[in-house]
Amino acid sequence: IVLRPSRVHNSEENTMRALTLKDILNGTFSYKTFFPNWISGQEYLHQSADNNIVLYNIETGQSYTILSNRTMKSVNASNYGLSPDRQFVYLESDYSKLWRYSYTATYYIYDLSNGEFVRGNELPRPIQYLCWSPVGSKLAYVYQNNIYLKQRPGDPPFQITFNGRENKIFNGIPDWVYEEEMLATKYALWWSPNGKFLAYAEFNDTDIPVIAYSYYGDEQYPRTINIPYPKAGAKNPVVRIFIIDTTYPAYVGPQEVPVPAMIASSDYYFSWLTWVTDERVCLQWLKRVQNVSVLSICDFREDWQTWDCPKTQEHIEESRTGWAGGFFVSTPVFSYDAISYYKIFSDKDGYKHIHYIKDTVENAIQITSGKWEAINIFRVTQDSLFYSSNEFEEYPGRRNIYRISIGSYPPSKKCVTCHLRKERCQYYTASFSDYAKYYALVCYGPGIPISTLHDGRTDQEIKILEENKELENALKNIQLPKEEIKKLEVDEITLWYKMILPPQFDRSKKYPLLIQVYGGPCSQSVRSVFAVNWISYLASKEGMVIALVDGRGTAFQGDKLLYAVYRKLGVYEVEDQITAVRKFIEMGFIDEKRIAIWGWSYGGYVSSLALASGTGLFKCGIAVAPVSSWEYYASVYTERFMGLPTKDDNLEHYKNSTVMARAEYFRNVDYLLIHGTADDNVHFQNSAQIAKALVNAQVDFQAMWYSDQNHGLSGLSTNHLYTHMTHFLKQCFSLSD
């Protein structure tokens, strides 16, 4: 159980106040984290409060301004990047968001040694992606879907690709579906460790169907946004990987990396690229039916100036119970011999664990084991492997950092974070300097977040980087809700839940219950993290109980739970929310006439299906930007979990699992449907179809659209959205305004 500190003295209680919706919308109680921008084993950069870029040397204790805020301000820079030789800094301004990760910007290069901006051969604008080489100060950038190279910032550019074309051919950057569902980055190019080679992906979207929607703007006529977007079963992008020698780029030009034969025989994806050395690269490929992944290690052949990927260096990862990997197929972390690697995948018991692969996957040596999961490998050094897991005290929603000594035999394991600030910190991530000489720990909760700096050899804490003192002080007179994380055991399924309780919670009273659901495959909602958000307000001020439940399909509790939803989305996720609600009612403090459910995106889909389940449990509910039919969503995501919408595959369940098919069942609930009209991700089409089905069934419902807003409903729309949803819930629960 995680209880926020309760304050029971009456004298104190009088001075304390509940959270307000305004607090949440203004971000009054937001926290800060500190991630050092490492530039060596013992140095990092950080942007100071007054916007100077400051270099800190941990060993000397010295710090100095490397770039003045005057320079940042002169071009309205919102971001920066130091070249590895420390001669130059790129300054990023005119940020213009595209999709989740992608944006364009204007880039200026500042010469640190000469104290002035680089003139001559300036960068074009806007640029889609720009990065320094790992050594020196070469620049690679993408402009109008083509890749360019500069040996030095002031040099003329060398054009690497020429076929780039908007919405057709993408070089060095992903198309929509690869960005959102496969790479989770804005870039698709990778420098080799010493900057000798540059690898890049080319995505051909020529044959992909286009989603078109209106962007209303301020003009007399709306404009149409067109995005090549493969929905389930549609034609996919065609991907090719090339590598170019950046020292002599014109000599042989880009060389294509061959695709493994077993992958190339049918539709496939490229999933990631990892450089091992300057002359060895590792590519990961995935069949369109995403239960077979191939890791291919390729070597540079000097004589032919080509890349060779021998079959003996192909490693196959296959799932017989679900899809390959978790949300994504994990990436390898290579050891110093430059051929063996560490990787997370399912063990024989169906738990994701670290394995060491020296020759074949079959002979992999399991490094971690147990009925818990290894989540991320942070760093492998000569003698240590740092990773995170949810092993400690068997709470799946925690994250601790562990160190395994791989230099000694047998390897010994140490939890670096488990006992540091045990009550305050149970959910960590880490950021390591070169050779793991030092590292920063960022604790996200359940207490107020704190970031600390540590010695990589001894794990000793060196200093606190950010402890959110102002937040701590601001919260002193706030009546925060209580939070508890517990589990329900139902029919051999463990359902972990987080309950957020009003500050003066009394088990003998009855409270309205709001279920907040996401529930997507490989997601996790029940986490030991700090948050002061909308649901905190609903508990603190409006006296609601809020519950989050991780049901079947969610992550980090083994493959049985994770893959339970394989090919059957929309069934067990909903069942488990309903089961949990019934258990909560049995606890005795829930008013069963006042139960609501809400969710966003996948959560909007689940909340809609739960409302239409015919159980009579829910009085009302909200779906924000829901998926309504899996035929409307992206191929890469949907097919991973559902297969193809074809007769000989899984069309039947595609049809059975739509929200529209259950339109009649909304008759006895109050339903609020919300969507942004410019949602590039879950298209407005989804809500349009729900609305049409409800109208055709003559079912009353409420709806709100947000013109020109995407899947995030940001800016002023956020305020409007939460105000609107609050009114809806208060009305549903008969709470006075």
Partner: antibody, heavy 124, light 113 residues
Framework: QVQLVQSGAEVKKPGASVKVSCKTS????????IHWVRQAPGQRLEWIGG????????NYNQKFKGRVTITVDTSASTAYMELSSLRSEDTAVYYC?????????????????WGQGTLVTVSS | DIVMTQSPDSLAVSLGERATINCKSS????????????LAWYQQKPGQPPKLLIF???TRESGVPDRFSGSGFGTDFTLTISSLQAEDVAVYYC?????????FGQGTKVEIK
Amino acid sequence: QVQLVQSGAEVKKPGASVKVSCKTSRYTFTEYTIHWVRQAPGQRLEWIGGINPENGIPNYNQKFKGRVTITVDTSASTAYMELSSLRSEDTAVYYCARRRIAYGYDEGHAMDYWGQGTLVTVSS
Amino acid sequence: DIVMTQSPDSLAVSLGERATINCKSSQSLLYSRNQKNYLAWYQQKPGQPPKLLIFWASTRESGVPDRFSGSGFGTDFTLTISSLQAEDVAVYYCQQYFSYPLTFGQGTKVEIK
């Protein structure tokens, strides 16, 4: 009045190194980069390299890379230029000069004040 | 590297007469963003360091007599001494500070005829 005062003349043997200092005064040291320029007898002025005292980062002319090291001691408002593996062609007067840091994108400044020069003679 | 070429190499002018020195750069020194030319002129007298006369091709450094003027843009520049004085006997150098490495012209020696 701004001053850049250089160390005295040096006579060095081929293969040796020379380190010339440039002590500055009466201005804010970290607001100007320091550059080193040499002038061999009857030759044009030749830029060797420079350094930004604000961050200690040097920049060298490729011609001298590997042989020259430019450093600063901000506490003493002094810049240093060390040239190694000396040869007879390195016989020249070596000047330090200051150049205002251009914080703005539209700026860019010439070298407005120079040291008096240091004669370095390389002879066996 | 940008190559700077001065002409003539030497120049003899009578006192009170106009002296004109040309400087040509191998690439443009005009910066499109601010429409400024990154070119400076220096005067060097025997046994002395160079002294800045003109920057941005045509702006006089403070304290420099107004008989010294600079003109030109792009790749072609001129330093003019409108009325030569005895104290103007020196070597004059043009220098580009558009990009690195900084480069100088070979110098023009101005003498009295």
